[in-house]
Amino acid sequence: FERTRSLQDPCSNCPAGTFCDNNRNQICSPCPPNSFSSAGGQRTCDICRQCKGVFRTRKECSSTSNAECDCTPGFHCLGAGCSMCEQDCKQGQELTKKGCKDCCFGTFNDQKRGICRPWTNCSLDGKSVLVNGTKERDVVCGPSPADLSPGASSVTPPAPAREPGHSPQ
């Protein structure tokens, strides 16, 4: 089948990085500057993506592959192929229409992106809070209260790094 197809369609012989040039009797011509073809048998080359402004070039365009972009510091990529740049926030914050806002009391975010999530409810697993949660960190659950009854080996929880913050939205 491949042999039959190549006899019928000379363009199928054109490798990646070239295109089948109808203006030159279907000769395989190299892709012009700032263009590429990632598969064989192409009748045109695609224009290279330009990483302009806040989009920085992560990988240069070649004759066989498109350029790849990322975002300048302070922003991160979103979407297929880094089609968008979204603002970073600090740990303990989430991004809203009003910009970066502190996590509400009882929630945390340990990353520069994403939303604030509720602290783990230790009591649902029959455990106690060993280390209090903060805006940046989830609570640490310890042994169940029964395990800490007199006679059982006691665990002294370390003091939390700081008081859990409360910032109304």
């Epitope: 968008m84 740049c85 979204e86 229409k97």
Partner: nanobody, 123 residues
């Protein structure tokens, strides 16, 4: 071609005012949130303000609240940033940026950016 082109930057004294403009082309202007984002010399990008499709909703970073006003004219495919009481720390390249599809719901990503206009606040 989808394009955003900023203008209006320049040198202004502390306490002065400036109005930036952003001309859009190649897309349905009134269907998108728009943003101003700035980059001070040697610093990272900082989001400044945004405005929704019909101009009824807008938000600002705390440091410019009450001094800057974002507005848009959908009939002219234009976005504006009126800046008053300018300070040295407002010195930056100011970019106009389009919010991507579904901006404000599932994400706050910006997909089209202008080339920027420089604002220098100095005496």
């Amino acid at each position: 071609e989808v394009q955003l082109v900023e203008s209006g930057g320049g040198l202004v004294q502390p306490g002065g005012s400036l109005r930036l403009s952003c001309a859009a082309s190649g897309f349905t202007f009134g269907s998108y949130w728009l943003n101003w984002v700035r980059q001070a010399p040697g610093k990272g990008l900082e989001w400044v303000a945004n405005i929704n499709q019909d101009g009824s909703e807008n938000y600002y970073v705390d440091s410019v609240e009450g001094r800057f006003t974002i507005s848009r004219d959908n009939a002219k495919n234009s976005l504006y940033l009126q800046m008053h009481s300018l300070r040295a720390e407002d010195t930056a390249v100011y970019y106009c940026a389009r919010g991507g599809e579904d901006y404000g719901n599932s994400h706050f990503g910006m997909d089209v950016w202008g080339q920027g206009t420089m604002v220098t606040v100095s005496s």
